[in-house]
Interface confidence: low
């Protein structure tokens, strides 16, 4: 039970005090007791419960006619059962006794009031009165946890606006309200109570720029909401009528958790005694609600796809046809960014990452816009953000970034358990340098900080700086699987490719050609590839780099070798000994449920079938996956990207609720 104030009683004159239902009020009966008195008794109105404890050891007794020794070891506490109909209608009488004096009486007139600030602390999607049930001032994780949740109101319900909803002080309509969390102030007081008392709603100054609170006028349109707390207003005096009254507030977060903001916001209601205008306002009671701002959550390839994004560029009609067919098979919506809007920037994966935010009452997809800011710069903000589709960005918006800040370098694993620790929403994966040095690249610290601060998908730094482009999607992918952990990790594997080519040569196919059917591309015989010492050395280095990540992924995701599938792939080292794919990089695939869009490798055709395609099918089809090989050679591959780099996917949010995990 919440602690109330301390009330001092004195025999000289009656004491008047306020007691808030659900709080424990201490009675100081000693400090003003008559000098010669040695004991006391208490009588109270039926609406007041008095507890007397005399310790140690504490002997508890509710009031009766007993007398108690008057010493500091006696604790007297009051609680009230019902709110008062009129001021001071509950009475407590203390009688002091001494050996030589007649009893001396002290009177206490109590006013019982109900004041409670309620939010959805049980995370059911509904606000229930919580008085004396749970402590709302703490926020705890886990299925038995408690605490309310706020969404950053980062969508744009007003299509005529260019800003996010949280960037204005207005409530647009009921759609806008649904992105906010309801908080209710319930009061029950005597009619004249607020002539001498005031309620103040306030937020810590350190948190005022992270939240905005609107007060709703009950029964009126949402447009009657007015802002009461926010970046300019840390406190607000409430006009509350006496009697029984409920007041609704709608709360929106303005910032995601980040390195300087752990995501917790406390809203407090304070009851002030303003009866003596000569004295400062005295705080009689406080009630608080702690909210946690919902984190931005990424979705792995194992989540069902809902929408596919790609770019229309010069001469990629066939590519788009293939992606369209695949999207139709997977029953996905398809959004194409036209040429005039992408300004020849086809790398949809690099520009953005689509995740979501969730509260018990609402789930919202949110696009995380990378700071790479090339031709697709405006696409996330102009075409993706909208009603019920949020937006967030981090990092410098003008320069100061590297290729590792593009979101082909940002992936997330499916849910995993690692040495007993559960990651029910998976773990974020991004590429980094192997060790810091003058010429190494890394993801911008602002991006790293943001990803870590979300708390629910603890990031793992992989090593991708060995690649020319430097993105993790160039050597790994995840696909759904019906068994084991529910997925497989796919890793690009030069070792597996050399093994395959060697087998083909042993069977007499050494003359078979890589790149057959591609105009203006020098074709290569299997036997020449196998005898090319430089290429072998290049791929030996690449293999070591991928093995490095393999070990890291096994350790950080709790994987066994049987959870990993090696996809045959060769690389070549270019400028500064950085690697790029030797033929279309098959691991850089589009995963739409069981439908996979894989870069067509143009491998050696043996018995009428590409041996690389055949190998990949033999590895993935037993998992119930369907492989479609997409020709991206001239439109994507020679520009150092593939199918995954050129597409993006919005996926279904996890059914698991993030607040039920323990980070």
């Amino acid at each position: 039970m919440a602690q109330g104030t301390l009330i001092r009683v004195t025999p000289e004159q009656p004491t008047h005090a306020v007691c808030v239902l659900g709080t424990l009020t201490q009675l100081d009966i000693c400090s003003s007791a008559p000098e010669d008195c040695t004991s006391f008794s208490i009588n109270a109105s039926p609406g007041v419960v008095v507890d007397i404890a005399h310790g140690p050891p504490a002997k508890k007794k509710s009031t009766g006619s007993s007398t108690w020794p008057l010493d500091p070891g006696v604790e007297v506490t009051l609680t009230m059962k019902v709110a008062s109909g009129s001021t001071g209608d509950q009475k407590v009488q203390i009688s002091y006794y001494g050996p030589k004096t007649p009893p001396v009486k002290a009177l206490l007139y109590l006013t019982g009031v109900e004041i409670s600030l309620c939010a959805d602390i049980t995370r059911t999607g509904k606000v229930k009165p919580t008085r004396a049930v749970k402590d709302q001032r703490t926020w705890t994780w886990g299925p038995c946890g408690q605490g309310a949740i706020l969404l950053v109101n980062c969508d744009r319900d007003n299509l005529e606006s260019s800003a996010m909803d949280c960037e204005d002080d207005e409530v647009l309509d009921s759609e806008d309200l649904q992105d906010m969390s309801l908080m209710t102030l319930s009061t029950k007081t005597p009619k004249d109570f607020f002539t001498n008392h005031t309620l103040v709603l306030h937020v810590a100054r350190s948190e005022m720029d992270k939240v905005r609170v609107f007060q709703a006028t009950r029964g009126k349109l949402s447009s009657k909401c007015s802002v009461v707390l926010g970046p300019k207003w840390p406190s607000h005096y409430l006009m509350v009528p006496g009697g029984k009254h409920n007041m609704d507030f709608y709360v929106e977060a303005l910032a995601f958790p980040d390195t300087d903001f752990p995501g917790l916001i406390t809203l407090t209601i304070s009851l002030l005694d303003t009866s003596n205008l000569e004295l400062p306002e005295a705080v009689v009671f406080q009630d608080s609600v702690v909210f946690r701002v919902a984190p931005w959550i990424m979705t792995p390839n194992t989540q069902p796809p809902q929408e596919v994004y790609a770019c229309s560029i010069f001469e990629n009609e066939d590519f788009l046809k293939s992606v369209t067919t695949l999207a139709m098979k997977a029953k996905c919506k398809l959004t194409i960014c036209p040429e005039e809007e992408n300004m020849d920037d086809q790398w949809m994966q690099d520009e953005m990452e689509i995740g979501y935010i969730q509260a018990p009452h609402k789930t919202l997809p949110v696009v995380f816009d990378s700071p790479r800011n090339r031709g697709l710069k405006e696409f996330p903000i102009k075409r993706v953000m909208g009603p019920d589709f949020g937006y967030v960005t981090r990092g410098p918006q003008t320069g100061g970034i590297s290729g590792l800040d593009s979101f082909g370098n940002l992936e997330v694993s499916p849910p995993v358990t690692v040495r007993g620790k559960e990651y029910p929403l998976g773990r974020i994966l991004f590429g980094d340098s192997c060790y810091p040095s003058n010429d190494s690249r890394q993801m911008h610290q602002a991006l790293q900080d943001f990803l870590s601060a979300q708390q629910v998908q603890a990031p793992v730094k992989l090593y991708s700086d060995w690649l020319s482009v430097g993105h993790v999607d160039e050597f790994l992918s995840f696909v759904p699987a019906p068994d084991r952990k529910g997925f497989r990790l796919l890793l690009a594997s030069p070792r597996s490719c050399y093994k395959l080519f060697q087998e083909q040569q042993n069977e007499g196919h050494g003359e078979a050609l890589l790149f057959e059917g591609i105009k203006k591309k020098k074709q290569q015989k299997i036997k020449n590839i196998l005898s090319n010492k430089t290429l072998r050395e290049h791929n030996s280095f690449v293999e070591r780099c991928i093995d490095w990540n393999r070990e890291l992924l096994k350790r950080e995701l709790g994987l066994a070798e049987s959870d990993i599938i090696d996809i045959p792939q060769l690389f070549k080292l270019k400028e500064f000994s950085k690697a790029e794919a030797f033929f279309p990089n098959m691991v850089n695939m589009l995963v739409l449920g069981k439908h996979l869009g894989i870069p067509k490798p143009f491998g050696p055709v043996i018995n009428g079938r590409c041996c690389l395609e055949e190998k990949v099918c033999s590895l993935l089809e037993p998992l119930g996956l369907q492989c479609t090989f997409i020709n991206d050679f001239f439109t994507y591959h020679i520009r150092h990207g593939e199918v995954h780099c050129g597409t993006n996917v919005r996926r279904k949010p996890f059914s698991f609720k993030w607040w039920n995990m323990v980070p």
């Epitope: 192997c434 060790y435 810091p436 040095s437 730094k461 070591r544 093995d547 070990e551 890291l552 350790r555």
Partner: antibody
Framework: EVQLLESGAEVKKPGSSVKVSCKSS????????VVWVRQAPGQGPEWMGG????????HYAQKFQGRVTITADEDTSTAYMELNSLRSDDTAVYYC????????????WGQGTLVTVSS | EIVLTQSPATLSLSPGQRATLSCGAS???????LAWYQQKPGLAPRLLIY???IRATGIPDRFRGSGSGTDFTLTISGLEPEDFAVYYC??????????FGGGTKVEIK
Amino acid sequence: EVQLLESGAEVKKPGSSVKVSCKSSGGTFNNYAVVWVRQAPGQGPEWMGGIIPMFDTPHYAQKFQGRVTITADEDTSTAYMELNSLRSDDTAVYYCATSYFRQWLPRDWGQGTLVTVSS
Amino acid sequence: EIVLTQSPATLSLSPGQRATLSCGASQSVSSNYLAWYQQKPGLAPRLLIYDASIRATGIPDRFRGSGSGTDFTLTISGLEPEDFAVYYCHQYATAPQITFGGGTKVEIK
């Protein structure tokens, strides 16, 4: 967890060299960086350099450049640190440690080798 | 090179008390590549915290690292008898110029 076993204590004369070995077990030697850190009596640790066996590239702290050689033998999972032109202020405990991915962050440490330089 | 300055040099506390150790860097430590080690006499240092705030495997949650840029803190929320030792901070962001702080000795009062 990786276990590291270092060679025994050495007493050396000024101007001579010392070569300390560090044998690794319980992990993939290739996938770790091995770093060398020394600690003079009553002082804080001092980073000397390190090597990633996988890339076979040693890195040396400026202070020791030209005087220290760090090598690794993948076959025996052993790393070596050789320090030349010894002086009395090189008297210290020399530790090898492995670091996993956070490249130069010592995680699992050897027991240390005391090298005393005295005439 | 980045110079790490630890303060105080010695901290005299009783078991159960909170210890707050500071480590200041002469310039910003990129990626928050800063670690904390505990060292007891005659033993090798033991990794407690890396990347400024991540607890190493097996380290009790009474050890907490915080900070970024140039100011870092190690907090031990309730000192246990086995926590009395020397603590070093270490930045590993600027290979090969990697440095350790001078140490803070936490002793029994």
